[in-house]
């Protein structure tokens, strides 16, 4: 019988008492085969973290700063359940740390030196740790003691709780630096008042502070937010303009064997019986003998943290950067305007080899990072382990939902000013063998299908979106008799046709021979009835253009396209017989790397792009013998996006809507994790 006990860690006598009450009340409402609580008392949160890591306890609720400590080796804990605030309909699990300024003040984030600053309090998250952590490498040296460096950075400050004797500049705007509400500039509202009164130029608070202090929109319109990309935005656009997104209070557990499902089962049942307004005798979110015991008194309930989410992803790149800077205190030798090497994310060993060759030819401009799947790469770019990669539109959507931005688009048509003219897109098509003359778009049920990969545009999102509209369910593996859709569950019929050996079977990378455009077409040639690819795939792999044994004798005339009206057309008539127009593949990166990725890639394509005529003797960025490694092989150049610089603008309303509709069928664990951070 599996042990269904969750050992909760308590950090004080009062918490231990509440924990025992929690345990007893849960016993009274949960059947004997359900989850139960045991209480473990430790002297501090750090002791609780260590106890969980050592398997002496299972769970504890932590503030964001401690979630970071819990994640660090050797603890390796992960977030499993989040407290939420507000309503069940609009649950808030995060708050945003923001920098508020007056509208007419005219400076940006990178111009804060010499300004006057208002802080909620020394050592507090939104008011100190996050802004000072992010500004850390701009502070004058020596950076220790930190208070002295901050005092020398700003021309005056109010940082309540600072030592006014040692660091008078930190108390210049609020004499005495009182550490309670007796100081009119203490806390969130106090820091905002410090700005409002004209004492300071910038206030470091949380996103709700301005709404709580100014009910009137006209008053709020006198203020703006400073964004990390050195722009400003209105105060209600805090989701797109903040210093960090911070989880409020989170239950953590071991990453391996951490009982996360059991902890959720326990807390979900606990909130049903003892949540807000549920029971008089025991209340989960109330602390009669103290404040915020076990859980925050202001919490309204719990939400399960998606399993794909580790602490780095949960805390977010900005928060982790800020806290790491403060803790480790390391900065580059001397900040320069030089761009650091771009860390390109390569999928599996084929792409890694091409990336390594690019890296040595780039003379230090490109470094390589490997991952096994596109989603793993996106996650690495999110957390700073990698910087950029080129993605199919379906993954541009996921990357966008995860906070990444498109920076350059692949262009596939030769033109005079290729780099200045991003194209409208390519065509997603359904290809069949000419010999299967009875096959049409209307009778695909029970046939064998070949897809580039799950989540990709031409191979999945477009055809499956159209199919979903017809069949109104997500069981595509029942619609087709079998197929190869790399990235499907291994036991699915949509992995049955795949050719990868062993663990590589149906993997969404080049170790699976039927992966990607060329792979899906090969699947059709060798085993399938229909392949969902791009309009250039057939000509690129027939007529001797692909020298591989399976392709060298193929003839374009032996294949036809399925049109949505139930007819068929020759392959060259794709403009009048396609499933939809697909946005071109695009390079994505984090917002903070956008300028450098843009600059370095434009240099790289001038050196190694399609102007290189002899790819047998020189490195060519856009060539890999039909394997589409790092970039599509038919890329002519990487083009500027002009104003299409967000994922929504880049992909276009129609495509975003189509993928959004297909979201209910999504098996993307990364998309689930990212929409948890930003619903």
């Amino acid at each position: 019988v599996p042990d269904k006990t969750v050992r909760w860690c308590a950090v004080s006598e009062h918490e231990a008492t509440k924990c025992q009450s929690f345990r007893d009340h849960m016993k009274s409402v949960i059947p004997s085969d359900g989850p139960s609580v045991a209480c473990v008392k430790k002297a501090s949160y750090l002791d609780c973290i260590r106890a969980i890591a050592a398997n002496e306890a299972d769970a504890v609720t932590l503030d964001a700063g401690l979630v970071y400590d819990a994640y660090l080796a050797p603890n390796n804990l992960k977030p499993v359940v989040a407290e939420f605030y507000g309503s069940k309909e609009d649950p808030q699990t995060f708050y945003y740390a923001v920098a508020v300024v007056k509208k007419d003040s005219g400076f940006q984030m990178n111009q804060l030196r010499g300004k006057k600053s208002c802080h909620t309090g020394l050592g507090r998250s939104a008011g100190w740790n996050i802004p000072i952590g992010l500004l850390y490498c701009d502070l004058p040296e020596p950076r220790k003691p930190l208070e002295k460096a901050v005092a020398n950075f700003f021309s005056g400050s109010c940082a309540p709780c600072a030592d006014g004797t040692d660091f008078p500049q930190l108390c210049q705007l609020c004499p005495g630096c009182g550490c309670s509400t007796l100081n009119q500039y203490f806390g969130y509202s106090g820091a905002f008042k410090c700005l409002k009164d004209g004492a300071g130029d910038v206030a470091f608070v949380k996103h709700s502070t301005i709404f709580e202090n100014l009910a009137n929109k006209a008053d709020r319109d006198q203020y703006e937010l400073l964004c990390l990309d050195n722009t400003r935005k209105p105060v209600d656009e805090y989701k797109d303009c903040h210093l960090a997104q911070v989880p409020s209070h989170t239950v953590v557990a071991r990453s391996m064997g951490g009982k996360e499902d059991l902890i959720w089962e326990l807390l979900n049942q606990a909130q049903e019986h003892f949540g807000k307004d549920k029971s008089k005798e025991f209340q989960l979110f109330s602390s009669p003998h103290g404040k915020d015991l076990l859980f925050k008194d202001s919490a309204h309930g719990f939400l399960k943290v998606p399993p794909r989410m580790d602490a780095k992803m949960y805390l977010g790149y900005e928060y982790v950067t800020a806290i790491r800077n403060l803790r480790e205190g390391t900065c580059p030798e001397a900040p320069t305007d030089e761009c650091k090497p771009v860390k390109w994310c390569a999928l599996s060993h084929h792409e890694r080899l091409k990336c390594d060759e690019w890296s040595v030819n780039s003379v230090g401009k490109i470094e390589c990072v490997s991952a096994e799947t596109t989603e793993d790469c996106i996650a690495k770019i999110m957390n700073g382990e990698a910087d950029a990669m080129s993605l199919d539109g379906g993954f541009v959507y996921i990357a966008g939902k995860c906070g990444l931005v498109p920076v350059l688009a692949e262009n596939y048509n030769k033109s005079d000013n290729c780099e200045d003219t991003p194209e409208a897109g390519y065509f997603a098509i359904a290809v069949v063998k000419k010999s299967a003359s009875d096959l049409t778009w209307d009778n695909l049920k029970g046939k064998k299908s070949c897809h580039t990969a799950v989540g990709r545009t031409a191979g999945w999102n477009i055809p499956m979106g159209l199919l979903y509209n017809k069949i109104n369910h997500c069981r595509f593996d029942e619609f087709f008799s079998e197929g190869c859709a790399p990235g499907s569950k291994k036991d699915s019929s949509l992995c049955k046709l795949c050719m990868g050996s062993g663990l590589n079977l149906c993997e969404p990378n080049n170790k699976e021979g039927y992966y990607g455009y060329t792979g899906a077409f090969r699947c059709l040639v060798e085993k399938g009835d229909v392949a969902f690819v791009k309009h250039q795939t057939v000509p690129q792999n027939t007529g001797g253009k692909n020298p591989d044994p399976w392709a060298k004798n193929l003839n374009e005339k032996d294949y036809e396209l399925l049109c949505l009206d139930g007819t068929r057309k020759p392959v060259e008539e794709y403009a009048n017989c396609h499933l939809a127009r697909a946005p071109n593949h695009a390079v994505v990166t984090r917002k903070d790397k956008e300028a450098c990725v843009h600059k370095i890639l434009r240099q790289q394509q001038h050196l190694f792009g399609s102007n290189v005529t002899d790819c047998s003797g020189n490195f060519c960025l856009f060539r890999s013998e039909t394997k589409d490694l790092l970039f599509r092989d038919d890329t002519v150049c990487l083009a500027k996006l002009h104003d299409r610089n967000t994922y929504e603008k880049y992909l276009g309303e129609e495509y975003v809507k189509a993928v959004g509709n297909l979201r209910k069928c999504s098996t993307s664990s990364l998309l689930e994790a990212c929409t948890f951070r930003r619903p």
Epitope: H350, E357, C615, S616
Partner: nanobody, 117 residues
Framework: QVQLVESGGGLVQPGGSLRLSCVAS????????MGWYRQAPGKQRELVAA???????KYTDSVKGRFTISRDNAKNTVYLQMNSLKPEDTAVYYC???????????WGQGTQVTVSS
């Protein structure tokens, strides 16, 4: 088809040196970048060093300052001089011609390097 033949491996004590050679034969006039990779038991194959036809080089962090890659275009040969060897350098070392390897999974047979006292 390019043939790559590696040699020069062997058993050496920590702190010792070895020089690996890789000779390319076949249609080698067009080889641009050459690289040395290594694979230890149970580990992924990893880049050790690479060199372009013009002599640009790249090294993995763990071998910087100890290993030197060079090439002799006239002899169609790439070398890896390995000094101050450590036990963690133990692996099979492969040389690769990038212009083919990433499409055709083509590798030579490799040469075993063992660093042990």
């Amino acid at each position: 088809q390019v043939q790559l033949v590696e040699s020069g491996g062997g058993l050496v004590q920590p702190g010792g040196s070895l020089r690996l050679s890789c000779v390319a034969s076949g249609s080698i006039f067009s080889i641009n970048t050459m690289g040395w990779y290594r694979q230890a038991p149970g580990k992924q194959r990893e880049l050790v060093a690479a060199i372009t036809r013009g002599g640009n080089t790249k090294y993995t962090d763990s071998v910087k300052g100890r290993f030197t890659i060079s090439r002799d275009n006239a002899k169609n040969t790439v070398y890896l001089q390995m000094n101050s060897l450590k036990p963690e350098d133990t692996a099979v070392y492969y040389c690769t011609d990038y212009s083919r390897s990433y499409y055709q999974d083509y590798w030579g047979q490799g040469t075993q390097v063992t660093v042990s006292s």
